[in-house]
């Protein structure tokens, strides 16, 4: 066998994108590799070129159609192959039978906005992007707030165990700058994982009124 270790991991965004990462110890950075997708019950097949993302890791996106089109369902199986060029031929490096709705990672939430801000409270809303209608309300969210002098890793996680696209942050400090992020995960799928964190939303609480206790 080829020396070292390798890993091939793919996720479906629930609509029209399968993102894959291939890593192999000792593989040359300029190795030319591709991912091929062959669905078991669709007329199309798709290929993407793996591009380096780190020393021994490559990634690519299989774009199956328009961003909001529903290209796969719970009954689909897609056979995914990693092929790398060796001289004049392509060598199969890995093969995976991929059940899209067992391997979900949604797009990061978008359109974060402050709905209402006070001295100690802030109401924030967001939207989910390119999420399948199949989920109906079977989604959960995690949110975190960056306070001054802390890191994101130190921020406590707030869990929303339902499809709730808003949050009311409380016990905030007046006249203070904060940042807020949220991520989403479907309840379905053995290998499903959290979406990336949203872009941070910066906001500032209102100053306390002069002469009043805070």
């Amino acid at each position: 066998a080829v020396n070292g270790t390798s890993q091939f991991t793919c996720f479906y965004n629930s609509r029209a994108n399968i993102s894959c990462v291939w890593s192999q110890d000792g593989a040359l950075q300029d190795t030319s590799c591709q991912v091929h997708a062959w669905p078991d019950r669709r007329r199309w097949n798709q290929t993407c070129e793996l591009l380096p993302v780190s020393q021994a890791s490559w990634a690519c996106n299989l774009i199956l159609g328009a961003p909001d089109s529903q290209k796969l369902t719970t009954v689909d199986i897609v056979t995914l192959r990693v092929l790398c060029r060796e001289g004049v031929r392509w060598r199969v490096m890995a093969i995976q039978d991929f059940k899209p709705f067992e391997n979900l990672r949604l797009m990061a939430p978008i359109s974060l906005q402050v709905v209402h801000v006070e001295t100690h409270r802030c109401n924030i809303s967001w939207e989910i992007s390119q999420a399948s209608h199949y989920f109906e309300r079977h989604l959960e969210f995690e949110a975190r707030t960056l306070s001054p002098g802390h890191t994101w890793e130190e921020a406590p996680l707030l869990t929303l165990k339902q499809k709730q696209e808003w949050i009311c942050l409380e016990t905030l400090t007046p006249d203070t700058q904060y940042e807020f992020q949220v991520r989403v995960k479907p309840l379905q799928g053995e290998f499903t994982t959290w979406s990336p964190w949203s872009q941070p939303l910066a906001f500032r609480t209102k100053p306390a009124a002069l002469g009043k206790d805070t």
């Epitope: 066998a1 890995a94 093969i95 039978d97």
Partner: nanobody
Framework: QVQLQESGGGLVQAGDSLRISCAAS????????MGWFRQAPGKETEFVAG????????HYADSVKGRFTISRDNAKNTMHLQMNNLKPEDTALYYC??????????????WGQGTQVTVAS
């Protein structure tokens, strides 16, 4: 606990056929690709063949293509490797392995103990 148990190895003559098998615990068998690796004395572990768990897509090393056939019996949680036209260079300890992917690297998640295949010239 995952169990992979090989059987069917033995001593055969060059040109003969042999079928080795691998029994797996149910959860592994229904959720993982299965494969065969081999290790000859003094050599590195070599990928032989693999089969995926849902579509039974197969992949073979060039050295065995056309001679070996991998298959799986889902009703019995068993995988087989039918080896025809065996050659002395096929002599090795044959390992059954399971992983989410067929990979040509020998870092699969689960391994059996191995069954010895010896091909005499």
């Amino acid at each position: 606990q995952v169990q992979l148990q090989e059987s069917g190895g033995g001593l055969v003559q060059a040109g003969d056929s042999l079928r080795i098998s691998c029994a797996a615990s149910g959860r592994i068998f229904s959720n993982y690709a299965m494969g065969w690796f081999r290790q000859a004395p003094g050599k590195e572990t070599e990928f032989v063949a693999g089969i995926t768990h849902l579509t039974s897509t197969t992949h073979y090393a060039d050295s065995v293509k056309g001679r070996f056939t991998i298959s799986r019996d889902n009703a019995k949680n068993t995988m087989h490797l039918q080896m025809n036209n065996l050659k002395p260079e096929d002599t090795a300890l044959y390992y059954c392995a399971a992983d989410r992917n067929i990979k040509i690297t020998a870092d699969w998640s689960y391994w059996g103990q191995g069954t010895q295949v010896t091909v005499a010239s």
